[in-house]
Interface confidence: medium
C-alpha cells in the first residue's frame, strides 16, 4: 500500500508568492510559492495519486503583513481552502498568546491541529479542550493512518504561550500516544511536529512505532540529487534514521516560506512496516501556475492590506541585508539600521551633562526575518518592514548592570555557527569575539558609547555600572535564552511598536544607506 505525503513547514505567513529569497515578490515571472501555486500542485497530485495526505508541521503564523493584519484568520481560511489534512502546532502559533491561537485558528480550522506534548492546566484546560489533539486517525483510501503531533519544548522561551500550557519533552510525551494508536490497530504512524531536525531524528530513533517523521522549525532543506534553487541540502531526502529497534525511519522537512512542497512516497507492507520511501521537495516556481480561484480569493483578502503596503516610507540606495546567513553570524546592515532607528526613537532628556539618556541597542539576529532589495526602485513600504519585523513587538528601555550585558554577549556566541537567533546585532556598542575560546569566555573586548559626554566616544564596559539599553521586548522577557536579562534587569519600561519605530526613522531620514562598519568583530 502506497502513501503520498505532501508537507509544508515554517510557511510564516507567505500567502502570496515571493521572490527567490522569500521576500516580497518583485518580478512575478521569477516568483515562487504562495498558496495559489501550492494549491495547483497539491490538486494535481491528488488527482494523479490515490492515497494523499497534505500535512503542515507548524509555524504558519508570523512573517508578513498578512499576519500583522489578519492575526491567523488568514491561516485558517487558506489552509481550509487547500484542504490540509492535519497541522502540528509550531512555537509561532503562540505569538499572540493562547487567545490569538484559539480564536482565529483552533476554532476555525477544518482539519485536526495536533500536539501531544502540550498539556493545558488551570482555567485554560476546559477552554482549550478538544481544540487541539495529541493525535488523529485519518482515513486514507481504504487504510488508516495515525498522525501524532509535537511542538518544541522551547516554546515558552520563543513565544508567548502563557503560564497555563506545559510543554513536555517530545519523546516522553509521544511514546504513550503512539502506543495508544497501536492498541487501536493503527499500524501506520506519522510523527508530525515542530521541534527542529535534531529532535526529528531523535524521535525517529527513540519513539517505538513511528514510521515517518515530518518536521519543521529548523528550516532544514533536504534533497536527493542536484538542488533546484539556492538552498544547500543538509542531507538526502528523505533522511533515513535507524531506530533503536532496527527500523529504517524516513525523516523529512521542506525548508520554509512555502517555497517547496515536500513530496514523500512511502510503501507499506500489510503489517504497516515501511518497505521503501523516496521523493524530493518540489520547488514551487513560476512553471506551476497559480490557481485562479485561490488567487482571486487572495486578491480579495489583499484589499485590507493595501493601506499598509502601498505607502512609500522612504528609500534605500543599498541592499538591506536581513538574511539569516548574515544577521545570525555577523554584523549586518539591517541590524545596524534597526538599532540606529531604536536609538533615534529615544533621543530625549538631553542636558548639559548627557547628550542623550541612552546610547546602546541590542537586537537578536533571529528577530530580523527578511532582507529588503533596493532594486525595487529603492522603495521601502510598511509591508517590507512587516516582513523584516513580523512579530508585532515593542522596542523597550531597560536598565542593566555591565555584568549582565557581558553575560548577554557571551550568550550571543555561546553556540556560534548553528544559525541560532541569539547572535546580537548592536548599536552604540563595539564588541570583539574570539571564537577559538571556550563558550562563556569569548568576549575579549566590549566598548560602549558614552552618554555622559558632549562628544560621544567608546569606553570599556564597567561591570558594576548601570546602563540603559534599548532592546526588543522579546529580549527583555528573556527570549532566545537571554534569561540573564529578564532575571537581572533593574528597570523595564515598555516602548513603541517595532515596525513603527523603524518606519518613522526611515520617513525622517528619507534616504538611507546603512553600512557594515565594524561594530562586531
Amino acid at each position: 500500500w502506497e502513501l503520498t505525503i505532501l508537507h509544508t513547514n515554517d510557511v510564516h505567513s507567505r500567502l502570496e508568492q515571493t521572490s527567490e529569497d522569500s521576500s516580497k515578490c518583485v518580478n512575478a515571472s521569477r516568483c515562487m510559492g504562495g498558496v495559489a501555486r501550492l494549491f495547483t500542485k497539491v490538486q494535481q497530485i491528488r488527482r494523479a495519486e490515490p492515497n494523499v495526505l497534505l500535512l503542515d508541521a507548524g509555524d504558519q503564523y508570523q512573517g508578513t503583513i498578512w499576519f500583522t493584519v489578519y492575526k491567523g484568520a488568514e491561516v485558517a481560511h487558506f489552509m481550509n481552502a487547500l484542504r490540509y489534512d492535519a497541522m502540528a502546532l509550531g512555537n509561532h502559533e503562540f505569538d499572540n498568546g493562547v487567545e490569538g491561537l484559539i480564536e482565529p485558528l483552533l476554532k476555525e480550522a477544518k482539519f485536526p491541529i495536533l500536539s501531544a506534548n502540550i498539556k493545558a492546566k488551570g482555567p485554560l484546560a476546559s477552554q482549550i479542550s478538544g481544540l487541539y489533539l495529541p493525535y488523529k486517525v485519518l482515513p486514507v483510501g481504504d487504510e488508516v493512518v495515525g498522525i501524532v503531533g509535537y511542538t518544541s519544548k522551547e516554546t515558552p522561551f520563543l513565544s508567548n504561550p502563557g503560564t497555563n500550557l506545559v510543554f513536555e519533552d517530545e519523546i516522553t510525551a509521544l511514546q504513550p500516544e503512539v502506543d495508544k494508536l497501536k492498541t487501536l490497530n493503527v499500524n501506520k504512524i506519522i510523527a508530525l511536529g515542530h521541534s527542529g531536525f535534531e529532535t526529528d531524528k531523535l524521535i525517529a530513533q527513540k519513539v517505538r512505532g513511528v514510521d515517518v517523521v515530518v518536521g519543521g522549525h529548523s528550516n532544514t532543506f533536504l534533497y536527493t540529487g542536484n538542488p533546484p534553487s539556492k538552498e544547500v541540502p543538509a542531507g538526502k531526502y528523505p533522511f533515513i534514521v535507524t531506530s533503536d529497534d532496527g527500523r529504517k525511519v524516513p525523516v523529512v522537512q521542506a525548508y520554509a516560506f512555502g517555497k517547496y512542497l515536500g513530496y514523500l512516497k512511502i510503501e507499506f507492507d500489510e503489517r504497516g512496516n515501511v518497505i521503501s520511501s523516496h521523493g524530493n521537495p518540489i520547488l514551487l516556481n513560476s512553471s506551476i501556475p497559480e490557481d485562479p480561484s485561490i488567487k482571486a480569493d487572495i486578491n480579495k483578502w489583499r484589499i485590507k492590506l493595501d493601506n499598509y503596503s502601498t505607502q512609500e516610507l522612504g528609500k534605500t540606495i543599498v541592499y538591506l541585508d536581513g538574511s539569516s546567513q548574515s544577521c545570525r553570524f555577523r554584523e549586518c546592515n539591517m541590524g545596524n539600521l534597526i538599532c540606529d532607528a531604536m536609538i533615534n526613537n529615544n533621543l530625549r532628556h538631553a542636558d548639559e551633562m548627557f547628550w542623550n539618556h541612552v546610547s546602546m541597542c541590542i537586537l537578536n539576529g533571529g528577530g530580523i526575518r527578511s532582507p529588503i532589495d533596493e532594486r525595487n526602485n529603492g522603495t521601502i513600504t510598511w509591508e517590507n518592514l512587516a516582513a523584516v519585523l513580523p512579530f508585532g513587538g515593542t522596542f523597550d528601555l531597560v536598565q542593566l548592570k555591565g555584568s549582565t550585558l557581558k553575560k548577554a554577549f557571551e550568550h550571543s556566541v555561546h553556540r556560534y555557527g548553528q544559525s541560532t537567533g541569539e547572535f546580537l546585532q548592536v548599536g552604540g556598542i563595539h564588541v570583539v569575539y574570539d571564537l577559538s575560546r571556550k563558550p562563556g569566555d569569548r568576549v575579549v573586548k566590549l566598548d560602549v558609547l558614552c552618554t555622559k559626554c558632549r562628544v560621544p566616544s567608546y569606553d570599556p564596559l564597567k561591570m558594576d555600572e548601570i546602563y540603559k539599553v534599548i532592546l526588543p521586548n522579546f529580549l527583555a522577557n528573556g527570549g532566545d535564552g537571554f534569561q540573564m536579562i529578564k532575571d537581572e534587569l533593574l528597570r523595564h519600561d515598555s516602548g513603541d511598536q517595532d515596525i513603527n519605530v523603524v518606519s518613522t526613522y526611515i520617513s525622517k531620514m528619507k534616504v538611507i544607506y546603512p553600512a557594515v562598519e565594524g561594530r562586531i568583530k
Epitope: N80, R83, F111, S293
Partner: antibody, heavy 121, light 107 residues
C-alpha cells in the same frame, strides 16, 4: 441563513438525461464540498458523489461512474448533478448536501429540499 | 465497500421511553459516523457526528456511543417530535454508505 435550494421535479423517459441544480446561499460556496444523495420511494439513502466547488475536484461512487457528472458554476454559487442513460430504477428524490469538514470529522450539515426525478416511458 | 446494517428496522415506543438504535459496519469505521433524522417528505437532519458529538441545536436527549464496527444512537426520553426515521452513515473509505434506516413509530 445557510441554505441549499434545489430545482423542481423532473419527469424523464428511459435513456434520457436529467440535470438537477442546487443553489447555495448564506456561506462561502467555494469552501465546502457539495455531495449528492438519492432516495428511492420508501427506501434508504444512497451517496452518489461530491464536488469541491473551488476547483471542480470530484469523487464518485463507483456505482454511478460514467453516468453521473457533477459540475459547479461558482459565479452563481450553484452545483449541478447530471445523470444520463436513465432507467426506471433511477426514480428517486435527489438531494444535495453540504459536507462540513470541521477538524477532520465529517458530516452533512445542510441539505437541499430534494428534487423528485421520475423515469417513466 | 463497507456495508452499514441498522437494527431494528422499525420500532414502536411511547413518549418518555428510552430508545436505542444500533448500527453495525462491515469494517472498522474509526468513529467516522454520523446519525440523521428524517421525517416524511423532508430532507434528513444531522443529529450527531464523530459517533458521539452532538450537532448544533440538537437536544441533549440524543446521544451516541460506540467504536470500531458497532455504534449506538440513544434517545433518553422520547418526545412527540422524535417519531421519524433514523439513519447512520459512515465517512471512512468511499463510498460513504448509509444504514437501511430505523423507523420509530408511536406505540
Amino acid at each position: 441563513q445557510v441554505q441549499l435550494v434545489q430545482s423542481g421535479a423532473e419527469v424523464k423517459k428511459p435513456g434520457a438525461s436529467v440535470k438537477v441544480s442546487c443553489k447555495a446561499s448564506g456561506y462561502t460556496f467555494t469552501s465546502y464540498d457539495i455531495n449528492w444523495v438519492r432516495q428511492a420511494t420508501g427506501q434508504g439513502l444512497e451517496w452518489i458523489g461530491w464536488i469541491y466547488p473551488r476547483d471542480g475536484f470530484t469523487k464518485y461512487n463507483e456505482k454511478f461512474k460514467g453516468r453521473v457528472t457533477l459540475t459547479v458554476n461558482t459565479s452563481i454559487s450553484t452545483a449541478y448533478m447530471e445523470l444520463s442513460s436513465l432507467r426506471s430504477e433511477d426514480t428517486a428524490v435527489y438531494y444535495c448536501a453540504r459536507k462540513e469538514g470541521y477538524r477532520g470529522d465529517w458530516y452533512f450539515d445542510v441539505w437541499g429540499q430534494g428534487t423528485t426525478v421520475t423515469v417513466s416511458s | 465497500d463497507i456495508q452499514m446494517t441498522q437494527s431494528p428496522s422499525s420500532l414502536s415506543a411511547s413518549v418518555g421511553d428510552r430508545v436505542t438504535i444500533t448500527c453495525r459496519a462491515s469494517g472498522n469505521v474509526h468513529n467516522y459516523l454520523a446519525w440523521y433524522q428524517q421525517k416524511p417528505g423532508k430532507a434528513p437532519k444531522l443529529l450527531l457526528y464523530n459517533a458521539k458529538t452532538l450537532a448544533s441545536g440538537v437536544p441533549s436527549r440524543f446521544s451516541g456511543s460506540g467504536s470500531g464496527t458497532d455504534y449506538t444512537l440513544t434517545i433518553s426520553s422520547l418526545q412527540p417530535e422524535d417519531f421519524a426515521t433514523y439513519y447512520c452513515q459512515h465517512f471512512w473509505s468511499t463510498p460513504w454508505t448509509f444504514g437501511g434506516g430505523t423507523e420509530l413509530e408511536i406505540k
